[in-house]
């Protein structure tokens, strides 16, 4: 299969900026490349086909170029409607592989997350499972790392993250990380902690609780 690699995965920009997204194919696809724009909850919209041909109705600020293995999509002057995720797709072979996407986000000022930790509810414990939630509120940029520690032992593979869409008012994100354990495992341990790192924080922030004391 032909693999498609897009970069960057996130592009921070302001209205009026010129932005360029790159797509590389693992082997030559001539000019059999399309670009799509997708907004949350909506179907992808075709912008460009055959690498540089503008789909009807698409503004001329979208410019496609390239052939062989290297392709670019340029937005000459970014407009408010252009904040979205962009995908390239090759259609040289039957697999019609997509790139992993580039999210064009609103460039904000750096904001460190406010961090909160929540123990499982008594109601949930009755069901035999325990979910501990670490909430990161109103941060920018989106890259943040959450590490879970149980009695100071690092946890891996038993947590899931969910990130909100960028807030239209202040350009920030919020994130929840959920550590899921069986009730039996939860009750074997005492101290539950989430450690957060983010570029707005000079040092990691840790929030914790002692089971049975909250």
């Amino acid at each position: 299969d032909i693999q498609m690699t897009q970069s960057p995965s996130t592009l921070s920009a302001s209205v009026g900026d010129r932005v360029t997204i790159t797509c590389r194919a693992s082997q030559s696809i001539n000019t059999w490349l399309a670009w799509y724009q997708q907004k949350p909850g909506k179907a992808p919209k075709l912008l460009m086909y055959k690498a540089s041909s503008l789909e009807s109705g698409v503004p001329s600020r979208f410019i496609g170029s390239g052939s062989g293995t290297e392709f670019t999509l340029t937005i000459s002057s970014l407009q408010p409607d252009d904040f979205a995720t962009y995908y390239c797709q090759q259609y040289n072979s039957d697999s019609k592989m997509f790139g992993q996407g580039t999210k064009v986000e609103v460039k904000g000022t750096v904001a460190a997350p406010s961090v909160f930790i929540f123990p499982p509810s008594d109601e949930q414990l009755k069901s035999g499972t325990a979910s501990v939630v670490c909430l990161l509120n109103n941060f920018y940029p989106r890259e943040a790392k959450v590490q879970w520690k149980v009695d100071n032992a690092l946890q891996s593979g038993n947590s899931q993250e969910s990130v909100t869409e960028q807030d239209s008012k202040d350009s920030t994100y919020s994130l929840s990380s959920t550590l899921t354990l069986s009730k039996a495992d939860y009750e074997k341990h005492k101290v539950y902690a989430c450690e957060v790192t983010h570029q707005g924080l000079s040092s990691p922030v840790t929030k914790s609780f002692n089971r049975g004391e909250c």
Epitope: S7, P8, K145
Partner: nanobody
């Protein structure tokens, strides 16, 4: 390991300018992001600005970020050939008086500041 050394601090009048430098040595190829923080007496360390030094999969190298206090007045840049980052500070105010620290994250831990300089004093007089 990466070592960071700041320079360029000093005394300046309100409305004036200063350029701070941060020179990196050691395993500089492992730097992902270089940032400037500042700390005024009795206050917490505050984020000022950052620049993506080595592009990972997320942002292009050269992408810049600013804190509220710096936006519009300060400019962060870097010169990879010289392994040096810069903070150009214009329209300085007395409230910009602080110790300015250079910090860096690694490609392995891109959101954690594992490397810090010793700091350089900036004093803005009215």
């Amino acid at each position: 390991q990466v070592q960071l050394q700041e320079s360029g601090g000093g005394l300046v009048q309100a409305g004036g300018s200063l350029r701070l430098s941060c020179t990196a040595s050691g395993r500089t190829s492992s730097i992902h992001l270089m940032a400037w923080f500042r700390q005024a007496p009795g206050k917490e360390r505050e984020f000022v600005a950052s620049i993506i030094w080595t592009g990972g999969t997320t942002y292009y190298a050269g992408t810049t970020f600013y804190g509220d206090s710096a936006e519009g007045r300060f400019t962060i840049s870097n010169d990879n050939a010289r392994n040096t980052g810069y903070l150009q500070m214009n329209s300085l105010k007395p409230e910009d008086t602080a110790v300015y620290y250079c910090a860096a994250t690694s490609l392995e831990n891109p959101t954690r500041y594992d490397y810090w300089g010793q700091g350089t004093q900036v004093t803005v007089s009215s």
